[in-house]
């Protein structure tokens, strides 16, 4: 009876989760109900005695199919080209770091770090992002100047809503500029890079929200927030893109013990967003203008906007006082790019549908690793590629566009039996000439099967060997696009394939 009841509950809870998804309930609500469903299923499993081993990837991870990899490679290509265009070098660091390296760098997010089980040696943790390892790398190598990019997987013990492109193992694409430079020039370049990449990817309209940690801290100070509560109130403010001010206020007052009038004063500020005119307006604010930190931050933002205008991206940037990125290491400018969903009603503002890139200035992080506390100013950005992959994949599915998963230029086929040796010789010649070529691994494949494979794989050309053609010293070259078939002299084949696939001269 107990098992039957549990089974019914699993069925009901499953239907409940599906219903919530259809109603487009909040991610957190869906996540909680999915967690409940998993707990119910686990109880069912325990009830069976020994649980059956289910073949699956761990929670929050996924495999990439060839189609998904093709999408991913294209996205990475756009990003890497942009990073290189801006003169970045590339580095790599270990997937795991000493636990101590990551400790105390992420504030409230530290609970999401994966610690490795102690094997009797060093205490290790999987990297949570690429920024802290970068700071460790700079300090360790006593570097004071570098412009680098780093693309690698990071690990977070989040409870991810994987449908929204969030995972426990995911790629980050980081670009950072380390060094002592004149204010806001590297910061502006980071924003320019972010805009270039997001525009190139053509994933839709986006907006980059900009703020400054010093403005936030100054604002909290003038509003009467105790120093000890700055960071925790910051994380509440950062939720404003997801929940209403009322809910944020309730959290500040009810859970974090802030006085309601202090919360109201914060509310007057954090609900404002605009451009350079808002920066100027706040510089005149009777309270903020008396706070040194806030004035410094506002002064830098004013300068930043001047550079953004010169870079031609000021229309993509919004100064948003509610932006309060959760990581503890930011010290100056912070920014976050969100994809915009166009408004359903005329006159409404476009709606942000999740962060796709973010970053900021972190001048103190390297100093945390330096025995003498020497600081190396840094500013950088991170592209949220997993979310971008999801968006691109969804778009491709909707358009039913065919995605090529190989780069093969030509399939080597034969029209008659007993021509395996000739096919092997020809495909080898093509490989040696740097042509991407394939053949079917059968001694006597049917021509129809070969042509079917050629079409399905989206290979542009097929080279068909026949007995007559061999005698005449030619190969039939057929194009998938034009359907035309031409006889090409064997010695001209490589050149003809190159010409038809616009491939420059290259060898292995």
């Amino acid at each position: 009876a107990d098992r039957a009841a549990l089974e019914e509950l699993v069925r009901l809870q499953g239907a409940h989760v599906r219903g919530l998804k259809e109603q487009k309930a909040s991610a957190e609500q869906i996540e909680e109900e999915v967690t409940k469903l998993l707990k119910l299923k686990a109880q069912l499993g325990q009830d069976e005695g020994k649980q059956k081993f289910v073949l699956k990837t761990p929670k929050g991870t996924r495999d990439y199919s060839p189609r998904q990899m093709a999408v991913r490679e294209k996205v990475f290509d756009v990003i890497i080209r942009c990073f290189k265009r801006h003169g970045a070098e590339v580095i790599d660091t270990p997937v795991f770091e000493l636990k101590e390296t990551l400790t105390g760098k992420y504030g409230e997010d530290s609970k999401l770090i994966y610690d490795l089980k102690d094997q009797g040696g060093e205490l290790l943790s999987l990297r949570y992002d690429l920024t802290v390892p970068f700071a460790r790398y700079l300090a360790m190598n006593k570097l004071t100047n570098i412009k680098r990019y780093h693309i690698a997987k990071v690990y977070r013990r989040d409870n991810p809503a994987m449908t929204r492109g969030r995972y426990r193992e995911f790629y980050q694409c980081d670009f950072d500029i380390a060094g002592q430079f004149d204010p806001m020039i590297p910061d502006a370049e980071c924003l320019k890079i972010m805009c270039e990449i997001l525009s190139s990817l053509q994933i839709g309209n986006f907006l980059v929200k900009v703020n400054d940690r010093r403005i936030l801290d100054g604002m909290f100070a003038v509003c009467g927030v105790p120093d000890s509560k700055f960071r925790t109130i910051c994380s509440s403010v950062d939720k404003l893109d997801k929940v209403s001010w009322e809910e944020v206020k309730n959290e500040m007052v009810g859970e974090k013990g802030l006085a309601p009038e202090v919360a109201d004063r914060i509310g007057d500020y954090v609900q404002q967003h605009g451009g350079v005119s808002l920066v100027e307006q706040l510089l005149q604010d009777p309270k903020l203008s008396q706070n040194k930190q806030a004035v410094e931050g506002l002064g830098d933002l004013k300068l930043l906007f001047e550079y953004l205008i010169l870079f031609g991206i000021d229309d993509k940037i919004s100064f948003d006082l509610s932006l309060a990125r959760g990581l503890d290491y930011y010290t100056g400018v912070i920014y976050e790019a969100v994809l915009l969903q166009m408004p359903t009603q005329a006159g409404e503002e476009p709606l942000g549908v999740g962060s796709i890139a973010a970053g900021g200035r972190y001048d103190g992080l390297v100093g945390m690793f330096d025995p003498k506390g020497r600081k190396v100013p840094c500013v950088g950005l991170s592209i949220g590629v997993e979310r971008i992959f999801s968006i691109v994949e969804q778009r491709l599915e909707a358009s039913e566009e065919k995605v090529r998963t190989t780069e093969t230029q030509v399939l080597v086929a034969s029209a008659q039996k007993k021509l395996l040796e000739e096919r092997l010789k020809l495909v080898s010649e093509l490989w040696d000439a740097g042509i991407k070529a394939e053949l079917l691994y059968k001694k006597n494949p049917k021509l129809l099967n070969q042509l079917q494979y050629w079409e399905e794989a989206g290979i542009p050309l097929v080279a068909i060997i026949g007995e007559q053609e061999l005698r005449d010293g030619v190969i039939k070259l057929r194009s998938v696009a034009s359907r035309e078939e031409v006889d090409v002299r064997r010695e001209d084949l490589v050149e003809e394939i190159r010409r038809r696939t616009n491939q420059p001269l290259s060898t292995c």
Partner: antibody
Framework: QVQLVESGGGLVKPGGSLRLSCAAS????????MSWIRQAPGKGLEWVSY????????KYTDKVRGRFTISRDNAKNSLYLQMNSLRAEDTAVYYC?????????????WGQGTLVTVSS | DIQMTQSPSSVSASVGDRVTITCRAS??????LAWFQQKPGKAPKLLIF???NLESGVPSRFSGSGSGTDFTLTISSLQPEDFATYYC?????????FGQGTKLEIK
């Protein structure tokens, strides 16, 4: 056997605070969602708040949100309800209750209740 | 919030009688409904969960049925210990709400 024992109730003036505790035994406390349900004298039952097994999720009814805070200490097998800015309408017997099958919002085990009286 | 309405608010019956109490939800709640029994000065006791499942240790004279918005608790043959107040509760969405109660009295 499953046992839930509430404590911390009493008489308090409007605007005052109280902290209710619930000691759990006889089951793996850290596996279960837990809740506080109250019943005003001579009235019906009202679900006040709940907390998930690992404290990731908490919810409150509109009447108490911003004033009450639910928390738990799995190491001590204890559930708590911090009640601030108390009002006369918060007067009730407060029951600590365990979720059915760990996660279903139906209370399959209840404490004996602790009376909270808010009066000047 | 989902409103739960019980009827009747009180009922008088004798030992051996068959008694039916109904509960209506203001919107569909699938089978997310429970029935509780409460005696004066005591905590409620779970009788039925997800509309029709009998909680272990509860006598089989208690049964539940319904789905969507209309639900029923039936006691097939009243026993002296069954005189109490009965509550229904929806567990579909927070805030989880109870009916106003049905008092079952001795005739």
């Amino acid at each position: 056997q499953v046992q839930l024992v509430e404590s911390g109730g009493g008489l308090v003036k409007p605007g005052g605070s109280l902290r209710l505790s619930c000691a759990a035994s006889g089951f793996t406390f850290s596996d279960y969602y837990m809740s506080w349900i109250r019943q005003a004298p001579g009235k019906g039952l009202e679900w006040v708040s709940y907390i998930s097994d690992k404290s990731r999720y908490t919810k409150y009814t509109d009447k108490v949100r911003g004033r009450f805070t639910i928390s738990r200490d799995n190491a001590k097998n204890s559930l708590y309800l911090q009640m601030n800015s108390l009002r006369a309408e918060d007067t009730a017997v407060y029951y600590c209750a365990r979720y059915l099958y760990q996660v279903i919002a139906i209370a399959d085990a209840w404490g004996q209740g602790t009376l909270v009286t808010v009066s000047s | 919030d989902i409103q739960m309405t019980q009827s009747p608010s009180s009922v008088s019956a004798s030992v051996g009688d068959r008694v039916t109490i109904t509960c209506r939800a203001s919107q569909g709640i699938s089978s997310w409904l429970a029935w509780f029994q409460q005696k004066p000065g005591k905590a409620p006791k779970l009788l039925i969960f997800v509309a029709s499942n009998l909680e272990s240790g509860v006598p089989s004279r208690f049964s539940g049925s319904g789905s969507g918005t209309d639900f029923t608790l039936t006691i097939s043959s009243l026993q002296p210990e069954d005189f109490a107040t009965y509550y229904c509760q929806q567990a579909e969405s927070f805030p989880y709400t109870f009916g106003q109660g049905t008092k079952l009295e001795i005739k």
